[in-house]
């Protein structure tokens, strides 16, 4: 049964398809494969803390250690990547904090940002100084393990020199890598000594070896690619938002809710209200009013602006976000001060009512 009563005839669904919103990432913890990772649950006053990964309960095992408010992952692998949450259960409510873990190699993100500097990798030699191939920029080759989300672009580089100028070819799992070996083929940029694969899929996993050779010698370097698959997830709200606020009577105030969602998020701003002098209906459920929701006629739904506030505007404001997978919500309190008191930004905490997640 629903755990609140809506005041007036306010629908919980948008009447028209909502517009897409700027989305914000939750905090991301990055580790290289093989490293250990420690994350502290950023929630206060937790009687009991439970952990989940991608919505599934997380228990201790030989690599995962749960001690109090700390989660430790030993010898991280790409399979440890995902959406984590810690939930603090208290006597009256519970609160959840989300974060991402990405066990990956940052330089395989696929951006061509460093291709502009590729010219220095193409070293021209004095024609008299014959020389076997050699690496010119080993820094760009240090990380051999690349864990990349599916659909991303991957770039492997083997900057080299030699005289005469060496040629470069690529092997996959020790065999000649042909264009027809993957959907969409791949690009080789000889000027930048790079192999580029767009929109990687699980079948792209494997060892990629660049072989650089001329008549005086041959060198090679192997990268390992792991493709991390994604799963759809419910909305994530940035921790600490909306933030508690205070203002004087007649002042203006803004609450902000930062949303991260793969799918179309439906954002609602809800406030506890009174009806006939009561905050609760006959069923014992609180009266709530939808102040704003995302839709065609709504401007940036991530922001709730209140103008010329009165004492009646004081109270708890809930940012509730849903998509087809599920919901998330966080709330903040507005304190309205008499005119003679100066307003101040309060400590940024979130409070979750017990009938919302």
């Amino acid at each position: 049964r629903p755990s609140f009563s809506l005041v007036e005839d306010t629908t919980l669904e948008p009447e028209e398809p909502p517009t897409k919103y700027q989305i914000s990432q939750p905090e991301v913890y990055v580790a290289a494969p093989g490293e250990s990772l420690e994350v502290r649950c950023l929630l206060k006053d937790a009687a009991v803390i439970s952990w989940t990964k991608d919505g599934v309960h997380l228990g201790p095992n030989n690599r995962t250690v749960l001690i109090g408010e700390y989660l430790q992952i030993k010898g991280a692998t790409p399979r440890d990547s995902g959406l984590y949450a810690c939930t603090a259960s208290r006597t009256v409510d519970s609160e959840t904090w989300y974060f991402m873990v990405n066990v990956t190699d940052a330089i395989s993100s696929g951006d061509d940002e460093d291709d502009t500097d590729g010219a220095e990798d193409f070293v021209s030699e004095n024609s008299n100084n014959k020389r076997a191939p050699y690496w010119t920029n080993t820094e760009k080759m240090e990380k051999r393990l690349h864990a990349v989300p599916a659909a991303n672009t991957v770039k492997f580089r083997c900057p080299a020199g030699g005289n005469p100028m060496p040629t470069m070819r690529w092997l996959k799992n020790g065999k000649e890598f042909k264009q027809e070996h993957r959907i969409g083929g791949y690009k080789v940029r000889n000027q930048h000594w790079s192999l580029i694969m767009e929109s990687v899929v699980p079948s792209d996993k494997g060892n990629y070896t660049c072989v650089v050779e001329n008549e005086y010698g041959s060198i090679n370097h192997t990268y390992h690619l792991d493709v991390v698959e994604r799963s759809p997830h419910r909305p994530i709200l940035q921790a600490g938002l909306p933030a508690n606020a205070s203002t004087v009577v007649g002042g203006d105030v803004e609450f902000v809710c930062k949303v991260y969602s793969d799918a179309q998020p439906h954002i609602q701003w809800i406030k506890h209200v009174e009806k006939n002098g009561s905050k609760y209906g006959p069923d014992g459920l609180p009266y709530l009013k939808v102040l704003k929701h995302s839709g065609i006629n709504s401007s940036n739904a991530e922001v709730l602006a209140l103008f010329n506030v009165t004492e009646a505007d004081a109270g708890e404001y809930i940012c509730k976000v849903s998509n087809y997978i599920g919901q998330a919500n966080q709330s903040a309190w507005l304190t309205v001060l008499p005119k003679q008191q100066a307003p101040g930004r309060e400590k940024e905490i979130t409070a979750s009512p017990d009938y919302l997640e």
């Epitope: 755990s3 669904e13 909502p18 989940t52 309960h57 179309q264 997978i325 919901q327």
Partner: antibody, heavy 114, light 107 residues
């Protein structure tokens, strides 16, 4: 592993009601919507509605509003879909699915016949 | 409600063929579309979500693309086990509507 197990097949008379259950396991029941989808014999898929078990928020296809009632019991991790005023056209397989539509129940055949 | 118009309603192809199914939404839905495979007597199986993301464990021969109102689902090299009915579904706004389905058969 994630599982959604539905109740067994039902044969109902026109005008009566049917209540189909969907027991979830292997994931946090309150963290995902539960959707209900139906498929008439030889026909396509039709979304009936969904519920967010944590707070009971439900959403319905207007074609079923007033006839379909979706509920959830957090204590048993079970979702229910009740369809009233049954008619022969309601003969179909009824599926529950987790919020991401990645996991589905095995389906419950409801036959409406006089 | 957003209507999803799927075509063709049926198609016959040979093993190894490239197969393409299209879905057109009556309103813009950004990339909020999923593709499912359903075999007789079984529940649908999620293949693609958010237009182009392959769900975990789905073979790489299945892919999706498109944005706004026009979407495409492709099987790069048809396998015998791919014989099934395929559905698109928009998950942008309720009610979450499905296409009419495409029945895929082997020549």
């Amino acid at each position: 592993q994630v599982q959604l197990v539905q109740s067994g097949a039902e044969v109902k008379k026109p005008g009566s009601s049917v209540k189909v259950s969907c027991k979830a396991s292997g994931y946090i029941f309150t963290s995902y919507n539960v959707h209900w989808v139906r498929q008439a014999p030889g026909q396509g898929l039709e979304w009936i509605g969904s519920i967010y078990p944590d707070n009971g928020d439900s959403s319905y296809n207007q074609n079923y509003k007033g006839r379909a009632t979706i509920t959830a019991d957090k204590s048993t991790s079970t979702a229910y879909m009740e369809l009233s005023s049954l008619r022969s056209e309601d003969t179909a397989v009824y599926y529950c699915a987790r919020g991401d539509f990645a996991y589905w129940g095995q389906g419950t055949l409801v036959t409406v016949s006089s | 409600d957003i209507q999803m118009t799927q075509s063709p309603s049926s198609l016959s192809a040979s093993v190894g063929d490239r197969v393409t199914i299209t879905c057109k939404a009556s309103n813009g839905i950004s990339n909020d579309i999923a593709w499912y495979q359903q075999k007789p007597g079984k529940a649908p199986k999620l293949l693609i979500y958010s237009a182009s993301y392959r769900y975990s464990g789905v073979p790489s021969r299945f892919s999706g693309s498109g944005s706004g109102t026009d979407f495409t689902f492709t099987i790069s090299s048809l396998q015998p086990e791919d014989i099934a009915t395929y559905y698109c579904q928009q998950h942008s706004t309720t009610p979450y509507t499905f296409g009419q389905g495409t029945k895929l058969e082997i020549k």
